[in-house]
Interface confidence: low
C-alpha cells in the first residue's frame, strides 16, 4: 500500500487461539466518521475488504471471515471470534469522510504447546563415540508461534558445544496452522552421565506473558567398558554354618560382562568354577564349613573378549563341630564323684557352659563339670553348650544322662482321689531309679507303661469304680534289681450333700505326676466342685 512505510506502527492486539479478538478502530472523529468505516485484512501486502459499517450498522463481506465478525461498542470495535493461527495479520479500518484515513491493528495469535513429550534413546550411548550421539528427542505439539526449546542436564541448561553438544530442532505445521516442534539432543557422554537427568523445556509466549513447560526427567543408558570386577558377599560380617550366603560378581561397566565365580581347590590350588543361579549369584544355603576358601570372579566382555579378574576374597564360614562329652553314659553310686568333660572344635574361640537339663540352671562356665557326693536327685540330664561369643547363634550342644544306682523311688507315697461309682478312672503312678524300674498294679485294669527318661517310668491304669475297689483302694508297686516301693491311692466317693458349690474345699483332684526329683506329695488343684480325676 503506497505510503504505508511512513505510517505509525500498528496497534498490537494479542489473543489466544480459539478466543475472540477485539479490534478497536482507533480513528478519532477528526480522522473519519466511525459510522462509515470499511475493515480490511492485509495478507502478503494484499488488502481484502471483510466488513462494512454504514450508519453504525455492520455487514460482513463474503469470504473466510463472513461467519466470525460482528460489531461492538457502538460500532467502534470489530469482534473476530474463534481466532486461528491464520488470523495473525494486519487488520485496518478506513474512515470515508471527510477524507480517507486508516488505522492499522496487528493481530498476534498465541497457543501454549502441549506438555513436552520426551523420549530417551532406548539403544543407549557408548562413551567412546567419535561424535555426539542422540540422547533424547523432545516433541512439543500444537503451539503457536513456534516455542523455543532448551535442554537441561542435571538442572543446568545445555549450550551448543562443538563436537560435544548439538541440538537439532525442526518444526512441522499442522493443518490447524499450529506448530509441532521436534528437538533432538545429541551429545558426547562420559561415564559419569549414567545417572544424569535430562529434560527439555518449552518456552512460549501468551498474552499474559512468557511461560514455560518442562518435560519429565529421563536418564539415558550409557555404555562404558568394564575396568574393575569385584566380589560382594551377603550378609556382610561374620558368617556361620546354616546361614544363607550369596556371593555375587559386580563390575563397573555397562553392560556388565559375563561373570563366572570360581573357588580355589585347597588340595590342587586350582580355581574350580562354581555353579551360579540364573542371575549369576552363587548361593550357599545352608553354608557349611567346607564352603570356606578363596573365591574370585572373572568378567568376560563378550564384545572385546577381554577378561578381567577380581581380587580374590577369602570366605570364612564359621562352625562349631559336634560336641563330645565323656564319659558318654555315666553310671555312679550314691555318694561318689563324677567329672564330665566337653570337647568341640571351631573356627573361632569357644566358650563352654554346663546346664541342668530339667531346670536350665547354669552349673559351670567351662568345659569341665565336677559333681561330688552324688545324691539320687543328681541323676538326670546335663547339657554342654559350646558357643562362639562373637557370633550370635553359633553353638552346638550335647546332652548326657547321669544315672545314680538306687531302688525305685515313688513320685508320691499316698494320695486321695474323689470318685463316683461306676465311672472309669484314669490313674497314674510314676517312679524312678537305676536301673529303671517297672510298675505293677494290685487291681485288674488296662495298664500302660511309658519311659519318661532313662531312670523314670510312668504307668497309667484305666479301671471301673466298683464297691469292692472302693473297699480295697489301689496300689502301684515299682521294682528293680535293687528293691521295690509302693504308692497308695485312696478312693473316696463324692458326697454332693456335704460338698456344695459354695464349700471352699481344697482337697480337689490331683494328677499323679510330679517332677522326678520332688520328694513332697503332689500338689492339689483347687476346685469349687470336685470332679472325678478322669472320665472314661
Amino acid at each position: 500500500v503506497p505510503g504505508e512505510a511512513e505510517q505509525p506502527a500498528p496497534e498490537l492486539v494479542e489473543v489466544e487461539v480459539g478466543s475472540t479478538a477485539l479490534l478497536k478502530c482507533g480513528l478519532s472523529q477528526s480522522q473519519g466518521n466511525l459510522s462509515h468505516v470499511d475493515w480490511f485484512s492485509v495478507h502478503k501486502e494484499k488488502r481484502t475488504l471483510i466488513f462494512r459499517v454504514r450508519q453504525g450498522q455492520g455487514q460482513s463481506e463474503p469470504g473466510e471471515y463472513e461467519q466470525r465478525l460482528s460489531l461492538q461498542d457502538r460500532g467502534a470495535t470489530l469482534a473476530l471470534t474463534q481466532v486461528t493461527p491464520q488470523d495473525e495479520r494486519i487488520f485496518l479500518c478506513q474512515g470515508k469522510r471527510p477524507r480517507s484515513q486508516e488505522y492499522r491493528i496487528q493481530l498476534r495469535v498465541y497457543k501454549a504447546p502441549e506438555e513436552p513429550n520426551i523420549q530417551v534413546n532406548p539403544l543407549g550411548i557408548p562413551v567412546n563415540s567419535k561424535e555426539p550421539e542422540e540422547v533424547a528427542t523432545c516433541v512439543g505439539r500444537n503451539g503457536y508461534p513456534i516455542p523455543q526449546v532448551i535442554w537441561y542436564k542435571n538442572g543446568r541448561p545445555l549450550k551448543e558445544e562443538k563436537n560435544r553438544v548439538h541440538i537439532q530442532s525442526s518444526q512441522t505445521v499442522e493443518s490447524s496452522g499450529l506448530y509441532t516442534l521436534q528437538s533432538i539432543l545429541k551429545a558426547q557422554l562420559v561415564k559419569e552421565d549414567k545417572d544424569a537427568q535430562f529434560y527439555c523445556e518449552l518456552n512460549y509466549r501468551l498474552p499474559s506473558g512468557n511461560h514455560m513447560k518442562e518435560s519429565r526427567e529421563v536418564t539415558v543408558p550409557v555404555f562404558y567398558p568394564t575396568e574393575k570386577v569385584w566380589l560382594e558377599v551377603e550378609p556382610v560380617g561374620m558368617l556361620k554354618e546354616g546361614d544363607r550366603v550369596e556371593i555375587r560378581c559386580l563390575a563397573d561397566g555397562n553392560p556388565p560382562p559375563h561373570f563366572s565365580i570360581s573357588k580355589q581347590n585347597p588340595s590342587t590350588r586350582e580355581a574350580e568354577e562354581e555353579t551360579t543361579n540364573d542371575n549369576g549369584v552363587l548361593v550357599l544355603e545352608p553354608a557349611r564349613k567346607e564352603h570356606s576358601g578363596r573365591y574370585e570372579c572373572q568378567g568376560l566382555d563378550l564384545d572385546t573378549m577381554i577378561s578381567l579378574l577380581s581380587e580374590p576374597q577369602e570366605l570364612l564360614v564359621n562352625y562349631v563341630s559336634d560336641v563330645r562329652v565323656s564319659p558318654a553314659a555315666p553310671e555312679r553310686q550314691e555318694g561318689s564323684s563324677l567329672t564330665l568333660t566337653c570337647e568341640a572344635e571351631s573356627s573361632q574361640d569357644l566358650e563352654f557352659q554346663w546346664l541342668r537339663e530339667e531346670t536350665g540352671q547354669v552349673l559351670e562356665r567351662g568345659p569341665v563339670l565336677q559333681l561330688h557326693d552324688l545324691k539320687r536327685e543328681a541323676g538326670g540330664g546335663y547339657r554342654c553348650v559350646a558357643s562362639v561369643p562373637s557370633i550370635p547363634g553359633l553353638n552346638r550342644t550335647q546332652l548326657v544322662n547321669v544315672a545314680i544306682f538306687g531302688p525305685p523311688w515313688m513320685a508320691f507315697k499316698e494320695r486321695k482321689v474323689w470318685v463316683k461309682e461306676n465311672m472309669v478312672l484314669n490313674l497314674s503312678c510314676e517312679a524312678s531309679g537305676h536301673p529303671r524300674p517297672t510298675i505293677s498294679w494290685n487291681v485288674n485294669g488296662t495298664a500302660s507303661e511309658q519311659d519318661q527318661d532313662p531312670q523314670r517310668v510312668l504307668s497309667t491304669l484305666n479301671v471301673l469304680v466298683t464297691p469292692e475297689l472302693l473297699e480295697t483302694g489301689v496300689e502301684c508297686t515299682a521294682s528293680n534289681d535293687l528293691g521295690k516301693n509302693t504308692s497308695i491311692l485312696f478312693l473316696e466317693l463324692v458326697n454332693l450333700t456335704t460338698l456344695t458349690p459354695d464349700s471352699n474345699t481344697t482337697t480337689g483332684l490331683s494328677t499323679s505326676t510330679a517332677s522326678p526329683h520332688t520328694r513332697a506329695n503332689s500338689t492339689s488343684t483347687e476346685r469349687k466342685l470336685p470332679e472325678p480325676e478322669s472320665r472314661g
Epitope: 523455543q148 532448551i150 542435571n154 538442572g155 543446568r156 541448561p157 549450550k159 559419569e192 545417572d195 544424569a196 537427568q197 518456552n203 506473558g209 512468557n210 514455560m212 526427567e217
Partner: antibody, heavy 115, light 112 residues
C-alpha cells in the same frame, strides 16, 4: 519434601579451619547442584561456589578459590564446605542452597572467628 | 563482576497497598537462550532466604500470586500487589548469568 539440614555453630580462632556440613533429603542428591552462600552480620548475601554431587564438578567465586573447598559424600547425601586460614572477616552465617535457582536453603550455620 | 543495585534501601507501605522494589544490573541478564536469569528472594529475620521469583517472572512453587516479577535486560521490578503483615522482610535480587553469581544489597519492606 526437600530438606537441607546444616551442622551446628562453630567458634574458631584466626588461622584455623572449619568444615560445615549440609545433609540433603527428600530428593535425588546426585541430580542437583548444592550452592554455598554466606551472610556476614547485618550484611547481604555473597555466593561462594557450587558443587554437583553427581560427578563432583565445582565452580568457585574467585574470591574464595584456594581457601574454600567444596566436597560431597553421596553415600550419606551430604555436602561439605571447608574454609582454611580463617580471618575475623569470615564471621558469618553460611548457607547451603539447592539447584541452579537456589530453590531450597539450609537453616544456616554460624561461624564465629575470634581470638 | 556484574554489579546489582537495589532501590530503595527501605520501603514503608500500608497494609493492602502495592509495594514496588527495583533492581538494576550493570550488564544485560538476557541470556542467548532467550531467558533472563534474574531471581528474587525474601528473607525474614533469623531465617534463610526463600526463592520467590526466578527467570525474571516465574513464581516459585507455593509463592502467593500477589508477588510478581517483571523487567527488561537490565532493569527489573518485584511487585507485591497487596502487602500483607507476613510480607515484612528483606528482599534480594540475584543474577545467574555470569560467575560469580551476585546479589543486590537488599530492600527492607516495613508496614507504614
Amino acid at each position: 519434601q526437600v530438606q537441607l539440614v546444616q551442622s551446628g555453630s562453630e567458634l574458631k580462632k584466626p588461622g584455623a579451619s572449619v568444615k560445615v556440613s549440609c545433609k540433603a533429603s527428600g530428593y535425588t542428591f546426585t541430580s542437583y547442584d548444592i550452592n554455598w552462600v554466606r551472610q556476614a552480620p547485618g550484611q547481604g548475601l555473597e555466593w561462594m561456589g557450587w558443587i554437583f554431587p553427581g560427578d563432583g564438578s565445582t565452580d568457585y567465586n574467585e574470591k574464595f578459590k584456594g581457601r574454600a573447598v567444596l566436597s560431597t559424600d553421596t553415600s550419606v547425601s551430604t555436602a561439605y564446605l571447608q574454609i582454611s586460614s580463617l580471618k575475623a572477616e569470615d564471621t558469618a552465617v553460611y548457607y547451603c542452597a539447592r539447584y541452579h535457582f537456589f530453590d531450597n536453603w539450609g537453616q544456616g550455620t554460624t561461624v564465629t572467628v575470634s581470638s | 563482576d556484574i554489579v546489582i543495585t537495589q532501590s530503595p534501601l527501605s520501603l514503608a507501605v500500608s497494609l493492602g497497598e502495592r509495594a514496588t522494589i527495583n533492581c538494576r544490573s550493570s550488564k544485560s541478564l538476557l541470556y542467548k537462550d532467550g531467558k533472563t536469569y534474574l531471581s528474587w528472594f525474601q528473607q525474614k529475620p533469623g531465617q534463610p532466604p526463600q526463592l520467590l521469583i526466578y527467570l525474571m517472572s516465574t513464581r516459585a512453587s507455593g509463592v502467593p500470586d500477589r508477588f510478581s516479577g517483571s523487567g527488561s535486560g537490565t532493569d527489573f521490578t518485584l511487585t507485591i500487589s497487596s502487602l500483607q503483615a507476613e510480607d515484612v522482610a528483606v528482599y534480594y535480587c540475584q543474577q545467574l548469568v555470569e560467575y560469580p553469581y551476585t546479589f543486590g544489597g537488599g530492600t527492607k519492606v516495613e508496614i507504614k
